[in-house]
Interface confidence: low
């Protein structure tokens, strides 16, 4: 079975990843608008998130506004919301499973069941990591695509916000943590072999005598 240190490391990384997904979800910095044209309306910086956008004045003053309605949102943003929320829930399930299957907890007595639970937790974290990487990478792809598209007016071009980097980090942590937990091989059960061996040995001994 994997060492206790490896298990703790896996859980710690996955929990950090889970927290980072929540941060990524909450921060209104998925996209930052680069207003760099003379024909645009406003010279403010706009931060767009999954739930709200914030207008940052040149003075540093910031005003945030929650999006009006779900239907008004672009489909990619709706999909990103859904995937990130599901990822947070899935990762929470992973945290729960990793606590239950942890070596240093007594929720399960059977070491084999513990190890299997930990592998399931690892797989769950891997799924959560993939669920984060998809919307983050898709959003980044769209931003890059628009930025280098000469048909897109300069006033409409966006840059990648901090949330995307947090999202990638979160995904990396979840995948790494989940991967470490998946290395948790169930213990090989040697009892039938040892019983058989001892019985054979005792029989051999009696025959010898």
């Amino acid at each position: 079975m994997a060492s206790m240190g490896l298990q703790v490391m896996g859980i710690a990384l996955a929990v950090l990843g889970w927290l980072a997904v929540m941060l990524c979800c909450a921060l209104p910095m998925w996209r930052v608008t680069a207003f760099i044209g003379s024909n645009i309306v406003t010279s403010q910086t706009i931060w767009e998130g999954l739930w709200m956008n914030c207008v940052v004045q040149s003075t540093g003053q910031m005003q945030c506004k929650v999006y009006d309605s779900l239907l008004a949102l672009p489909q990619d943003l709706q999909a990103a919301r859904a995937l990130v929320i599901i990822s947070i829930i899935v990762a929470a399930l992973g945290v729960l499973l990793s606590v239950v299957g942890g070596k240093c907890t007594n929720c399960l007595e059977d070491e084999s069941a513990k190890a299997k639970t930990m592998i399931v937790a690892g797989v769950v974290f891997l799924l959560a990591g993939l669920m984060v990487i998809v919307p983050v990478s898709w959003t980044a792809h769209n931003i890059i695509q628009d930025f280098y598209n000469p048909l897109v007016a300069s006033g409409q071009k966006r840059e990648m916000g901090a949330s995307l980097y947090v999202g990638w980090a979160a995904s990396g942590l979840l995948l790494l943590g989940g991967g470490l937990l998946c290395c948790n091989c169930p213990p090989r059960t040697d009892k039938p072999y040892s019983a058989k061996y001892s019985a054979a040995r005792s029989a051999a001994a009696s025959n010898y005598v």
């Epitope: 608008t33 044209g37 024909n39 645009i40 309306v41 406003t42 403010q44 706009i46 767009e48 956008n53 914030c54 207008v55 005003q63 506004k65 999006y67 009006d68 008004a72 672009p74 990619d76 943003l77 769209n142 695509q145 628009d146 048909l151 897109v152 007016a153 006033g155 409409q156 966006r158």
Partner: antibody, heavy 122, light 111 residues
Framework: QVQLQQPGAELVRPGASVKLSCKAS????????MNWVKQRPGQGLEWIAM????????RLNQKFKDKATLTVDRSSSTAYMQLSSPTSEDSAVYYC???????????????WGQGTTLTVSS | DIVLTQSPASLAVSLGQRATISCRAS??????????MHWFQQKPGQPPKLLIK???NVESGVPARFSGSGSGTDFTLNIHPVEEEDISTYYC?????????FGGGTKLEIK
């Protein structure tokens, strides 16, 4: 509720400048861009310019740069557009229209005044 | 400046039928997230009224028979079923860049 009040009609002689007004109520005047749109009889709509009452920042359709001058009076929540040296070509209905922003920067016209019919005639 | 070409210039539709109005922009007015195209209805002697913003978002208070679609350079306003009160002129308008421009208008009549 949001209201943009404009005089129904204005008569001006050719060459004599005219100042059209638009009184806003029902919202924070200094938080929204105010626009002016022209519509000649039986014709389409033409965006002239807009002004942000908070700092009087203006965005102008270059076609009207020598024709329209936009100002605001914050104390009375009124926007003005002055048309210089009007000719018969300037005879039209002039609307003031507020723009709101979807998420802070995606702009669209949401409220319109009833329009002022400007007649340029001697 | 972006030129918006509306077609047809006038349209006669029977009550209860579908009316389809097209608007073509001289260049794209969409990013991967948003289409900067809006639709207005104007009745004689009245100011324009916002029907649809950002290509497909129906303004609150606007009947569900109005719908908008499209992206890039081609946009469509659909009215189904057409009712008597829909007799108006319809305009598309972009907010992609300044100057903002309007289409030439489509006059909807009842057969």
């Amino acid at each position: 509720q949001v209201q943009l009040q404009q005089p129904g009609a204005e008569l001006v002689r050719p060459g004599a400048s005219v100042k059209l007004s638009c009184k806003a109520s029902g919202y924070t005047f200094t938080s929204y861009w105010m626009n002016w749109v022209k519509q000649r009889p039986g014709q389409g709509l033409e965006w002239i310019a807009m002004i942000h009452p908070s700092d009087s920042e203006i965005r102008l359709n270059q076609k009207f740069k020598d024709k329209a001058t936009l100002t605001v009076d914050r104390s009375s929540s009124t926007a003005y557009m002055q048309l210089s040296s009007p000719t018969s070509e300037d005879s039209a209905v002039y609307y003031c229209a507020r723009i709101d922003s979807y998420y802070g920067y995606l702009f669209y016209f949401d409220y319109w005044g009833q329009g002022t019919t400007l007649t340029v005639s001697s | 400046d972006i030129v918006l070409t509306q077609s047809p210039a006038s349209l006669a539709v029977s009550l209860g039928q579908r009316a389809t109005i097209s608007c073509r922009a001289s260049q794209t007015v969409s990013t991967s997230s948003y289409s900067y195209m809006h639709w207005f209805q104007q009745k004689p002697g009245q100011p324009p009224k916002l029907l649809i913003k950002f290509a497909s978002n129906v303004e609150s208070g606007v009947p569900a028979r109005f719908s908008g679609s499209g992206s890039g350079t081609d946009f469509t306003l659909n009215i189904h079923p057409v009712e008597e009160e829909d007799i108006s002129t319809y305009y598309c308008q972009h907010s992609w860049e300044i100057p903002w421009t309007f289409g030439g208008g489509t006059k909807l009549e009842i057969k």
